[in-house]
Interface confidence: low
């Protein structure tokens, strides 16, 4: 393990077109960049807390787990990992918290063998559409990622551009079909208001799930039924009043779900029969004994599996007195 | 049915080195992160290390960074910690554990029957 | 870091008591609590996740509840086969803390 303390040698961030350029010399099998710590037995690079503003030209060839965690990247271009010979056995890739707030298309690119990514703790006002599929081609080559870490890359309020947050991730996920082959995905802690209806249907492999802390109010217009392979929902710390009976088939079909509904706030009225009556028969749910009404206010912290039918009216809209027949 | 099967463990002189394998079974071995716990004889629980699925991401106690690395093999379904530098505050019984859940919940549902390692000259 | 304490560090109690035990977070970590408990010679044990989710196969004498820093766990009835230490362990942080236990005697 080698950990070199030069100052950092990069091509001037004046330049950054020069990020996408492939770099030309193959490093020296022992080399190790600047500010960066490698190990070639167990092929991994750390570039942590290093203030890095470009991802090092100079990776090794054998580098398999990459680190460049808590830099300042700020944009990450074209091509950023594109090398000669080509980064091929590099297959978990970890940007968390490292201040990026653009990735542009094909950024990931020649990365055969790329099967973790982990861009969480970024915030991600510009993440483009061809970020995971390189490329604008209604069908893209399938990507090699299993695993698609973005918790918490919402950037604040005044950084997002005048466009949906959730629009533009779901657009990165969906292009070209190229990320198919993801078993894991997870999006907590992202304000998501609402997950647009496509997102599921198009990502068939899903076996982990995390929408956790966000602010989803409901799940009505988004289908389940494809994802045959779901073991785990996250869907704790959100704003969810009720799940309705089409939404409750579908994560009954399921075989081998698991789902976690905890932290939400249930509003037991009417509407809430059905999802009642499912959560008593249902075993996907986990802790569901400890969900609990929110609203109405009379129903608040009533054990959503202690209530009956008759616990769950709807106030007329009117009072009795001003309604007419 | 879930098993972790912990070998290893056994006695080394200080500033020596050891390696932890945790075995696993019965599960998707590379949808689930994974982490080494450890309790000093007659003392509480310690986190360690917790390594994500694909083992891209890696996370340390202050106390053995820079000393011990945590690492796996989704081929063989075997976790590994590798203990450097070893200190007499090291001995423990080490303990691996599958995690469940997502980013903010996370908690460990299997853990295996432990390994002792045992720092003295 | 966050730190987490648990209080009392050891408890004397008889079968059917109610019993609880606390845990505070040195930062709000929202309901990212976990409870295991555990026997001498033993691994630890899985009982509550997510502040107040029962584990399965966990009996429903054991509860969780609180969230931000502040964290409780309950046995209703005391039964002979739960004496034992109970240790909680925050994973809202990267690095998952454990507090120092809770040891459960019979009085």
């Known amino acids: 393990s080698s950990s070199p303390t030069s100052s950092a040698s990069s091509f001037s961030s004046s330049a950054p077109f020069l990020a996408s350029a492939v770099s030309a010399q193959p490093p020296l099998p022992d080399q190790c960049p600047a500010l960066c710590e490698c190990s070639e037995a167990a092929r991994t690079v750390k570039c942590v807390n290093r203030n890095l503003t470009e991802v090092p030209t100079d990776l090794p060839a054998y580098v398999r787990n990459l680190f460049l965690t808590g830099n300042q990247l700020a944009v990450l271009p074209a091509g950023a990992f594109a090398r000669r010979p080509p980064l091929a056995e590099l297959a978990a890739l970890n940007l968390s918290g490292s201040r990026l707030d653009e990735v542009r298309a094909g950024a990931f690119e020649h990365l055969p063998s790329l099967r973790q990514l982990d861009l969480s703790h970024n915030p991600l006002a510009d993440l483009s559409p061809f970020a995971f599929s390189g490329s604008n081609a209604s069908v893209s080559a399938p990507s090699p990622l299993v695993e698609l870490i973005l918790n918490h890359i919402v950037p604040p309020e005044d950084e997002r551009q005048n466009r949906s947050f959730e629009g533009m991730v779901v657009a990165a996920l969906l292009a070209g079909r190229a990320l198919q082959g993801l078993r894991r995905l997870e999006l907590a802690s992202n304000h998501f208001l609402y997950l647009p209806r496509d997102v599921l249907a198009q990502l068939p492999s899903l076996r982990h799930l995390d929408l956790s802390n966000n602010s989803l109010v409901s799940l009505t217009y988004v289908s389940f039924r494809n994802l045959t392979h779901l073991e785990s929902l996250h869907l704790e710390d959100n704003a969810l009043k009720v799940l309705h009976n089409g939404t409750l088939a579908e994560l009954q079909g399921l075989p081998h779900i698991r789902v976690f509904l905890d932290n939400n706030p249930w509003v037991c009225d009417c509407h809430m029969a059905d999802m009642v009556t499912w959560l008593k028969e249902t075993e996907v749910v986990q802790g569901k004994d400890r969900l609990t009404c929110a609203y109405p206010e009379k129903m608040r912290n009533r054990v959503l599996l202690e209530l009956n039918s008759a616990d769950l009216d709807c106030d007329p809209i009117l009072p009795p007195s001003l309604q007419t027949s | 049915e879930v098993q972790l099967l912990e070998s290893g463990g056994g006695l080394v002189q200080p500033g020596g080195s050891l390696r932890l394998s945790c075995a696993a079974s019965?599960?998707?071995?590379?949808?689930?992160?994974m982490s080494w716990v450890r309790q000093a004889p007659g003392k509480c629980l310690e986190w360690v290390s917790a390594i994500s699925g694909s083992g891209g991401s890696t996370y340390y106690a202050d106390s053995v960074k820079g000393r011990f690395t945590i690492s796996r093999d989704n081929s063989k379904n075997t976790l590994y910690l590798q203990m450097n530098s070893l200190r007499a505050e090291d001995t423990a019984v080490y303990y691996c554990?599958?995690?469940?859940?997502?980013?903010?919940?996370?908690?460990?549902?299997?853990w295996g029957q432990g390994t002792l390692v045992t720092v003295s000259s | 870091d966050i730190q987490m304490t648990q209080s009392p560090s050891s408890l004397s109690a008889s079968v059917g008591d109610r019993v609880t035990i606390t845990c505070r977070a040195s930062?709000?970590?929202?309901?990212?609590l976990n409870w295991y408990q555990q026997k001498p010679g033993k691994a630890p044990k899985l009982l509550i996740y997510a502040a107040s989710s029962l584990q399965s196969g966990v009996p429903s004498r054991f509860s969780g509840s609180g969230s931000g820093t502040d964290f409780t766990l309950t046995i209703s009835s005391l039964q002979p086969e739960d004496f034992a230490t109970y240790y909680c362990?925050?994973?809202?942080?990267?690095?998952?803390?454990f507090g120092c236990g809770t040891k459960l005697e019979i009085k």
């Open positions: 930062q709000s970590i929202r309901s990212a």
């Open positions: 362990q925050q994973t809202y942080g990267y690095l998952h803390t």
């Open positions: 554990a599958r995690y469940y859940g997502g980013y903010y919940s996370a908690w460990m549902d299997y």
């Open positions: 019965g599960f998707d071995f590379e949808s689930y992160a």
